[in-house]
Interface confidence: low
């Protein structure tokens, strides 16, 4: 059995792609025939699943280039949290204990987001046992996680969140130190094996993997809304809106935002990615009648998808003894 | 990308079929190929694959010592010779390759070959 | 080598119709399950693959769920097209098997 490959390097040229180089193993131990490049999905952070993106004044946006976090100013009022489905009007509130604790965590918060990718990639991972690599592997990858009881959190199980095991994908690369891997998830976290496999591979298997992580680069316009904006009337001077989420966005939409106005689009509203989860909306609240224009806008991992066309509703004033009642 | 396959034959018990399968559209050394057959208003039989970067095989045991997968880069084809025939191994033959999913699921498939034995 | 199971072998179903098909290995599989779709004289058609993901250009209307030995497809809402005969295979283990396969018929 040859030893492993040396010096794996991997790099994105597309949203879509990762090109890997490695050189030949020190010790082919006889005739070297090809190797084994197999790839696997990362999970994402289980804390970026959970926490309310719509709690904090400051929006973490990842610059690619150089993998720094910039802490984005909100210039505007701070966001508050759109009532989802038939929760009923939404009011400030004075602080409780638990988003006093959760402005405690905020460091922490930061430092998580700040992290993620930067563990991902170079918090030594456990070697997978040697296995015969035409047998697709069965590695688990635990999701990291933390408990917290901060308001700024959510313990609604996202389906995604559950996924944190992705099947290995494979290929095989004959004479030759290089390979581009194709059909990628865009800015999404993979983990690339090489094995050198040499004339007695069939009989013996291939080497230990020699691994390396890769991200792959955003996709220009995956982080847009792909539908229309509908809405629907609801009682108390309220409308739901309704949009289709991102097919395959930038690794992870974190929220959406909404800004609707009746002359201007003046206001915003923020919707967690749970929110929308669980309704596949928002509702707007204490609307005075008349007609509106609303534009939404998804967040992710890697930026902003662009604003919808507009879609135009109206709240229709209430008549007679109803609007004498009230 | 596409995977077509020789057309119908009709063989006697004993005798042998080499069936083949002609890829285009992708690069042929680097994708497994996987036999199927189906038996008359039956079920899928895996009947194993080949590797066309160096011709290496596996097959299913049923089939072992009957079967044999080769492959011609030249023409980016590979063939199933199936030996010894008998009645039962009347069937569509298909051949199928994982490209876009993990090796073992099949995402693209030839159109079949009919293989009929019969004396 | 892996059995694998399919049931029912045939059901009746009107368009707009929730159907589930099951499939059991006889050991533990690890998620390595995908289902086929084959209409008579075509070659089957790759809908799921490992247990849950939804092959390329398969309508969302085709979902899957399982673990351990237990397997399922369902399609939420049945169209005209979706009559034909449906395969599971287990992928964890050579030789790769498949199930006898359910025959999905208009009622």
């Known amino acids: 059995v040859p030893s492993i490959p040396l010096d794996v390097l991997s790099a994105s040229n597309s949203s879509s792609q990762l090109i890997v180089k490695w050189n030949p193993p020190s010790l082919p131990n006889g005739n070297l025939s090809y190797y084994i490049v197999r790839w696997q999905r990362q999970p994402q952070d289980g804390y970026l699943y959970r926490h309310n993106y719509c709690s904090k004044d400051k929006i973490p946006i990842r610059k690619y280039a150089d993998g720094t976090i910039d802490i984005e100013e909100v210039t505007e009022n701070p966001k508050t949290e759109v009532c989802g489905g038939e929760k009923g009007p939404c009011c400030a509130c004075p602080k409780t204990e638990a988003e006093k604790q959760a402005e405690k965590e905020e460091a922490e918060y930061r430092k998580v987001f700040e992290n993620f990718l930067h563990n991902s990639i170079f918090v030594p991972r456990p070697e997978r046992k040697r296995r015969d690599v035409m047998q697709v592997a069965n590695t688990t990858m635990s999701s990291r996680s933390r408990n917290t009881t901060a308001a700024d959190t959510y313990n609604i199980t996202d389906p995604e969140e559950l996924e944190t095991e992705y099947p290995f994908f494979e290929s095989r690369v004959d004479n030759k130190e290089r390979t581009v891997i194709s059909n990628l998830r865009p800015f999404t976290l993979y983990r690339i094996d090489i094995h050198s496999c040499n004339h007695e591979a069939e009989k013996l298997g291939c080497s230990a993997s020699n691994f390396v992580f890769a991200r792959t680069m955003p996709a220009e316009g995956a982080d847009d809304i792909p539908g229309p904006v509908t809405w629907e009337p609801r009682p108390e001077n309220s409308i739901f809106l309704k949009w289709p989420e991102p097919e395959n966005p930038n690794g992870l939409i974190l929220m959406y935002e909404i800004k609707y106005g009746s002359q201007v689009e003046d206001q915003r509203e923020c919707v967690s990615r749970q929110e929308y989860r669980k309704y596949g909306g928002a509702k707007l609240n204490r609307l005075n009648p008349g007609n509106y224009t609303a534009r939404i806008q998804a967040t992710s991992l890697s930026g902003n998808g662009s604003w919808t066309d507009p879609v135009f509703f109206y709240v229709q004033a209430k008549t007679g003894y109803e609007n004498f009642i009230h | 990308v596409q995977l077509v396959q020789s057309g119908a034959e009709v063989k006697k018990p004993g005798a042998s079929v080499k069936v083949s399968c002609k890829a285009s559209g992708y690069t042929f050394t680097s994708y497994y190929i996987h036999w199927v057959r189906q038996a008359p208003g039956q079920g899928l039989e895996w009947m194993g694959w080949?590797?066309?970067?160096?011709?290496?095989?596996k097959y299913a045991q049923k089939f072992q010592g009957r079967v044999t997968m080769t492959r011609d880069t030249s023409t980016s084809t590979v063939y199933m010779e199936l030996s010894s025939l008998r009645s039962e191994d009347t069937a569509v033959y298909f051949c199928?390759?994982?490209?876009?999913?993990?090796?073992?699921?099949?995402?693209?498939w030839g159109q079949g070959t009919l293989v009929t034995v019969s004396s | 080598d892996i059995q694998m199971t399919q049931s029912p072998s045939s059901l009746s179903a009107s368009v707009g119709d929730r159907v589930t098909i099951t499939c059991r290995a006889s050991?533990?599989?690890?998620?390595?399950l995908n289902w086929y779709q084959q209409k008579p004289g075509k070659a089957p058609k790759l809908l799921i693959y490992y247990t849950s993901r939804l092959q390329s250009g398969v309508p969302s209307r085709f979902s899957g769920r399982g673990s351990g030995t237990d397997y399922s497809l369902t399609i939420s809402s049945l169209q005209p097209e979706d009559f034909a005969t449906y395969f599971c295979q287990q992928g964890s283990t050579l030789p790769y098997t498949f199930g006898g396969g359910t025959k999905v018929e208009i009622k």
């Open positions: 050991q533990d599989i690890s998620k390595y």
């Open positions: 199928a390759s994982p490209m876009i999913t993990p090796n073992y699921a099949m995402d693209y």
């Open positions: 080949i590797w066309p970067g160096d011709g290496s095989t």
